[in-house]
Interface confidence: medium
């Protein structure tokens, strides 16, 4: 039996994946639980098995098709249920009518690369992954640079308020190792949130030219 409060949160990656986390305060025995997706206007439905990520939370990914296939639209509503097995029966533990394009979280940007690096600046580009064509250019980015002796949390956020898949970092220190990350968010969706941060890209600025003796 399950007691306590339950939280069920899901995000759509805009293409073919709904990721869900279910948290349950009360004690849950070693029970098999599933997320079941039932679209209102599609002929498919889908389940995924919730696997523990901590003592009181479970997660799974509803894989709706090939990674770049557009499986849902702005008009879809998907009924999402958490069902847990109790003997031979399944008990509904949580339910929500999920509007995918109101609950977006894109995949982290990929293919980060240094386009050009100098002593004091560095030009970096990246690509977005599995993002719907529906967004056109309606995306924004946040970026951060890790300087020596600092943590990611201390790094100031740079905001790009348009779909710009490059950045020129300036006022860098010569001959210094940095790391760079970027994340993306669609402008659409009441509950939309930032993607995970990209994998960090390490780069080093060029050394300053040696001064000539006078």
């Amino acid at each position: 039996a399950v007691n306590g409060t339950s939280q069920f949160t899901c995000f759509y990656n805009s293409r073919a994946n709904i990721s869900c986390v279910w948290s349950q305060d009360g004690a849950l025995q070693d029970t098999s639980c599933q997320v079941h997706a039932w679209p209102d206007r599609r002929r498919w439905n889908q389940t995924c098995e919730l696997l523990p990520v901590s003592q009181a939370s479970w997660a799974c990914n509803l894989i709706l098709g090939a990674p770049d296939s557009q499986k849902l639209t702005t008009v879809d509503i998907v009924t999402l249920r958490v069902l847990c097995r109790e003997g031979v029966r399944w008990r509904v533990m949580a339910i929500q009518d999920f509007k995918p394009f109101e609950n977006l979280r894109l995949m982290a940007p990929i293919s980060l690369q240094v386009v050009h690096v100098e002593t004091h600046r560095c030009n970096i580009s990246w690509e977005i992954s599995q993002a719907s064509h529906y967004f056109e250019r309606h995306l924004e980015f946040e970026a951060r640079t890790l300087s020596p002796g600092h943590t990611w949390e201390e790094a100031p956020l740079l905001t790009l308020k348009q779909k710009q898949e490059w950045i020129c970092l300036e006022t860098l220190t010569p001959d210094t190792q940095y790391e760079f990350q970027v994340r993306v968010k669609p402008l659409q969706g009441e509950f939309t949130t930032w993607s995970p941060w990209s994998q960090p890209l390490a780069f080093r600025t060029k050394p300053a030219a040696l001064g000539k003796d006078t």
Partner: nanobody, 123 residues
Framework: QVQLVESGGGLVQAGGSLRLSCVVS????????MAWFRQAPGKEREFVAA????????EYVDSVKGRFTVSRDNAKNTVYLQMNNLKPEDTAVYYC????????????????WGQGTQVTVSS
């Protein structure tokens, strides 16, 4: 459209073992709960075993519990049925089935099917 191809069937003496394999192609394998069914001559096709998308949860018909083990290798797009201590009553054509909905996998109606592999257990 997903395609399923079974292999590993054959003739075996009672008490022996066989391992059936089913390779899945044409779609993203981890979308699917996988199952094995069997059909003996003159009988309905019956559910034998199923394994969820992650491979963590399995279920079996009572008559094979403790003798059969279903498993999957998501890297190889393959589901297996290890059959030990086989009995003459296990003789049947064994079918691999796939369904994106775990809750319908026991139903014969909405699954994708392989062509089947014959298992014959002699006494």
């Amino acid at each position: 459209q997903v395609q399923l191809v079974e292999s590993g069937g054959g003739l075996v003496q009672a008490g022996g073992s066989l391992r059936l394999s089913c390779v899945v192609s044409g779609d993203v394998f981890v979308r699917y709960t996988m199952a094995w069914f069997r059909q003996a001559p003159g009988k309905e096709r019956e559910f034998v075993a199923a394994v969820t998308d992650s491979g963590r949860t399995t279920e079996y018909v009572d008559s094979v519990k403790g003798r059969f083990t279903v498993s999957r290798d998501n890297a190889k797009n393959t589901v297996y049925l290890q059959m030990n201590n086989l009995k003459p009553e296990d003789t049947a054509v064994y079918y691999c089935a796939a369904n994106t909905d775990y809750f319908q996998i026991r139903s014969v109606d909405n699954n994708a099917w392989g062509q089947g592999t014959q298992v014959t257990v002699s006494s």
